[in-house]
């Protein structure tokens, strides 16, 4: 998970759409992707920022504990 | 209507510090960057870093080699610039300035005039 | 970091003539087709007013005698036609990557 946030972050040269992207990858079971995207004000960069790095992160999550779940079997 | 308003000019010794503020009004502040430039005499703009006061974070111009410092006040919508060690090079009008869009500087403050000299 | 190089230094036009202002990149200021290169206008006393943003984008109330163009490293700034009031220098500025860099700037004079 680490090694392709990295991967994505690094694209991002402004500091701020950097963090964006490090946000997005936070844990949050309450909330989507979309519904945390939509309390960012400071700027589509960001906003696009956290979504990809959000939705990346919450995809390998799911891909992990779905392998995780085939190993206890 | 958005507005940036700085301190007054400044005098200052070789050496010492020195803080200059920028209110802002007319927006909701923690949703904009605020950046400070600088321009000497006769010179052009130069970038010295900025804050976003929503999150607290930072980024430097590496020229300053850690002499300058960016902080907001949220409860009254300031951002502060401390620039240290102050020396004549250091002579020059800084300015705030808010980034639209983490895009463009959209308002400006009306500059402050810094002069170091002993 | 990303250098911009302004050309000319300076400028001097006859009102009602055009002036052309470039801003060479180091690198390209591109991502995803969006090209993030403004320009401000500074006269004596003033802070810098924004002029054009994302390249061709004009701010509110500034005239539709300036007009911005360009892509990836090599950018333009024009003024057609040139009236008094342009008499200022004119900066262009990347937003692309920290840190923000501005070109040298420009000087207009008018004749």
């Known amino acids: 998970l680490q090694e392709k946030i990295e991967e994505i972050a690094a694209k991002y040269k402004h500091l701020v759409v950097k963090k964006c992207c490090y946000d997005g990858v936070r844990i949050n079971h309450d909330e989507t992707c979309e519904q945390r995207a939509a309390r960012i004000s400071v700027g589509p960069r960001c906003v696009k920022a956290f979504t990809e790095c959000c939705v990346v992160a919450s995809q390998l999550r799911a891909n992990n504990s779905h392998k995780d779940l085939q190993l206890g079997r | 209507q958005v507005q940036l308003v700085q301190s007054g000019a400044e005098v200052k010794k070789p050496g010492s510090s020195v803080k200059v503020s920028c209110k802002a009004s007319g927006y909701t502040f923690t949703d904009h960057i605020i950046h400070w430039m600088r321009q000497a005499p006769g010179q052009g703009l130069e970038w010295m870093g900025y804050i976003y006061p929503r999150e607290g974070w930072t980024n430097y111009n590496e020229n300053f080699k850690g002499r300058v410092t960016i902080t907001a006040d949220k409860s009254t919508s300031t951002a502060y610039m401390e620039l240290s060690s102050l020396r004549s090079e250091d002579t020059a009008v800084y300015y705030c300035a808010r980034e639209r869009n983490l895009e463009y500087f959209d308002y400006w403050g009306q500059g402050t005039t810094v002069t170091v000299s002993s | 970091d990303i250098v911009l190089t302004q050309s000319p230094a300076s400028l001097a036009v006859s009102p009602g003539q055009r002036a052309t202002i470039t801003c060479k990149a180091s690198?390209?200021?591109?991502?995803?087709?969006?090209?993030?290169m403004n320009w401000y206008q500074q006269k004596p006393g003033q802070p810098p007013k924004l002029l054009i943003y994302?390249?061709?984008n004009l701010d509110s109330g500034v005239p539709a005698r300036f007009s911005g163009s360009g892509s990836g490293t090599d950018f333009t700034l024009t003024i057609n036609p040139v009236e008094a009031e342009d008499t200022a220098n004119y900066y262009c500025?990347?937003?692309?990557?920290?840190?923000?860099?501005f070109g040298g700037g420009t000087k207009v004079e008018i004749k």
């Open positions: 690198q390209s200021v591109d991502y995803e087709g969006f090209n993030y």
């Open positions: 500025q990347q937003s692309l990557e920290d840190p923000h860099t």
């Open positions: 994302a390249t061709s």
